[in-house]
């Protein structure tokens, strides 16, 4: 899927009004300096690809974030403001329904959400030069 045709300003507004708050809620109790993030993305479509990757897929040490509030709102925002995105998610939604697991917040998941916060911040500042 190509995120080039998304309405980036609407997605940014959704992030600022609600998704960012849900990410902060998830991270509550952790210090902002606790995770040393080196995440990167080069432009808005690339940032959304990385956000898609880390929000809806298991990674080393963190089995699932897809059922978290910020993830569901991210999926809704992409479905509404990225033409054709919903069609890519049919298999994924069915697979998620099959395996609803007990929520366990591990340190690795906190680290991953911290990475997501960095990617979202980068998405919101597309004209800044990448460090």
């Amino acid at each position: 899927y190509d995120f080039t045709n998304c309405d980036f300003e609407k997605i940014k507004a959704a992030y600022l009004s609600t998704i960012s708050k849900d990410l902060i809620t998830y991270m509550s109790g952790t210090k902002s300096t606790e995770f040393n993030n080196t995440v990167s993305c080069s432009n808005r479509p690339h940032c959304l690809t990385e956000i898609q990757s880390l929000t809806f897929n298991p990674t080393a040490g963190c089995a699932s974030l897809a059922k978290e509030m910020f993830a569901m709102k991210t999926k809704a925002a992409l479905a509404i403001w990225c033409p054709g995105y919903s069609e890519t998610q049919i298999n994924a939604t069915q697979a998620m329904k099959k395996r609803r697991k007990r929520k366990v917040t591990t340190n690795k998941c906190l680290e991953q959400v911290s990475q997501l916060q960095g990617l979202w911040r980068r998405f919101n500042r597309p004209l800044l030069k990448q460090q």
Epitope: Y1, V39, S40, C41, S42, H46, T49, E50, Q52, S53, L54, F56, N57, P58, T59, T88, Q89, N91, A92, A95, M96, Q115, L119
Partner: nanobody, 117 residues
Framework: QLQLVESGGGLVQPGGSLRLSCAAS????????MGWYRQAPGKQRELVVT???????NYVDSVKGRFTISRDNTMNTAYLQMNSLKPDDTAVYYC???????????SGKGTLVTVSS
Amino acid sequence: QLQLVESGGGLVQPGGSLRLSCAASESDFSIYIMGWYRQAPGKQRELVVTITPGGNTNYVDSVKGRFTISRDNTMNTAYLQMNSLKPDDTAVYYCNARNIFRNVDYSGKGTLVTVSS
């Protein structure tokens, strides 16, 4: 169906290094999170490292600082550089690719890494 072929495994002494490679058949390699699972004798398979399409990485604590995952999207290949290897790292290492949109996983047949003196 995505085909994955691992190479680079072998016998190495404690403290030594190995570099595993994973070649993928898919032309659209850039829609996959790539990762490496390992399975030691009598233990469950564990996902030890992952890399997103854009190169953002995650490691389990037991390999952090010793293992480095990288990818070359033009060559459809992922790499795992393993340094300061320990006997505990002995396992079959499986390359894994996950389509970031469809919750579909593909794995290779595995390559054996043995760390022993």
